[in-house]
Interface confidence: low
Amino acid sequence: HLIVTPSGCGEQNMIGMTPTVIAVHYLDETEQWEKFGLEKRQGALELIKKGYTQQLAFRQPSSAFAAFVKRAPSTWLTAYVVKVFSLAVNLIAIDSQVLCGAVKWLILEKQKPDGVFQEDAPVIHQEMIGGLRNNNEKDMALTAFVLISLQEAKDICEEQVNSLPGSITKAGDFLEANYMNLQRSYTVAIAGYALAQMGRLKGPLLNKFLTTAKDKNRWEDPGKQLYNVEATSYALLALLQLKDFDFVPPVVRWLNEQRYYGGGYGSTQATFMVFQALAQYQKDAPDHQELNLDVSLQLPSR
């Protein structure tokens, strides 16, 4: 059920493209294709290519993305395209000008002098933004989200975008300066991962990150469980980045117990993050436990 045909507007297309990209990434990283047959991988790659080609129709002259060509470009959507395309670079041929043009636009057009990334044109499909939805710590959460995308595109775009390292530093400065004031576990987790990627989650910040976990195994706010799966996935990625392998097993156990296999309304971010985090875990953690995740690879009929 993770392999779907992407279609629709610039937002719906990314909703459709997400599960296929992350499923292929997960199975590649964990070397599990033999369970499904390599021919299925080829079919999945064709769908990713289709999604990529379709997404280019929603690329604006500024290199940013929006739901429709005639809609103001969205910071979040553009950052998400960067994130997904950065992961897909290893799977299909992606034009680096498309990817790095979007990175450049985020930095030059959407980053304020204090490092914050601003959203002037929120996505129509609010269900696709996961725990960022109705987040009262919006500046921190969105800046962390964009920063994570920029860091994932860093190796690809550093030569084309001179301002990328400075932009990353500035956004990191903002997150670091405001981290201790965060109230929501979701924001603590996403900003924690962004800082961990930079080697800046330490001292009191690291203490806050770790003590925010409920029962030392999940980053949880009241409300939607999907957001807690997403937040805990960000936190797991941060822990793996920190090489804190003592803290990792109960978090992985909790995520595994949720039996969350992606798909369904509003699941875009939770799906992407849980599979990204668990793939990273199986790659990084010494003596990791084998995870029996139910990844079903039914290719859509043509």
Epitope: F68, K70, R71, E109, K110, K112, D120, A121, I124
Partner: antibody, heavy 119, light 108 residues
């Protein structure tokens, strides 16, 4: 083309609904904004509605003004707790080429409808 | 609401001359600025969007430009029919959007 209707003389506190009717295109693919202009004064932005029905308002208009799509060719502006300060010509305008009117501009415009609030 | 400060409030120019109108944003609005022309008894007409893009059917003598948070509308080779009031519309965010106070342009 666009045309506003519903403007009339009302007493303070009375609610009023204005309608913008479009012809030649469908609101399922277009955005619509409302702007007003007090007699002899400048333009004042009220808010807009996108093709999916999401609404965006100027901070001063939140709570008292409601924009809604009532059919594929009509958009309403509901106004409550009217005061004499709300006396103005009310214009509806489409987002240029169906886009976000704050980014791509507003074009075309209706001729406007006059609302007079007086006791 | 103080988002946009438009200057001057009125100006005049001879036919063939140049008119320059400025709008200063209270903070960064990037390209979220459009310019409108309004003649008495008529609705406004879009001239420029995205700070510098010419709207369809608008003569090329109208030019929009941006420098930081200052936006300029220049009309070169002014014609009699350009006599009107000109407004900028700037948007920091959907709820923080405003027109400038307007500039009345008279042609001598």
């Amino acid at each position: 083309s666009l045309e506003e209707s519903g403007g009339r003389l009302v007493t303070p506190g009375t609610p009023l609904t204005l309608t913008c009717t479009v012809s030649g295109f469908s609101l399922s693919r277009y955005t619509m904004a409302w702007v007003r202009q007090a007699p002899g004064k400048g333009l004042e932005y009220i808010g807009w509605i996108d093709s999916s029905g999401s609404t965006y308002y100027a901070s001063w208009a939140k709570g008292r003004f409601t924009i809604s799509k009532t059919s594929s060719t009509t958009v309403d502006l509901k106004m409550t707790s009217l005061t004499t300060e709300d006396t103005a010509t009310y214009f509806c305008a489409s987002g240029n080429d169906g886009g976000d009117p704050l980014y791509y501009g507003m074009d075309p415009w209706g001729p406007g409808t006059l609302v007079t609030v007086s006791s | 609401d103080g988002v946009m400060t438009q200057t001057p409030s009125s100006t005049s120019a001879a036919v063939g001359g140049t008119v320059t109108i400025k709008c200063q944003a209270s903070q960064s609005i990037r390209s979220w600025l459009s310019w409108y022309q309004q003649k008495p008894g008529q609705p406004p007409k879009l001239l420029i969007y995205e700070a510098s893009k010419l709207a369809s059917g608008v003569p090329s003598r109208f030019k929009g430009s941006r420098s930081g948070t200052e936006y300029t509308l220049a009309i070169s080779g002014v014609q009699r029919e350009d006599a009107a009031t000109y407004y900028c519309l700037g948007s920091i965010a959907s709820d923080d959007t405003a027109f400038g106070a307007g500039t009345n342009v008279e042609i001598k």
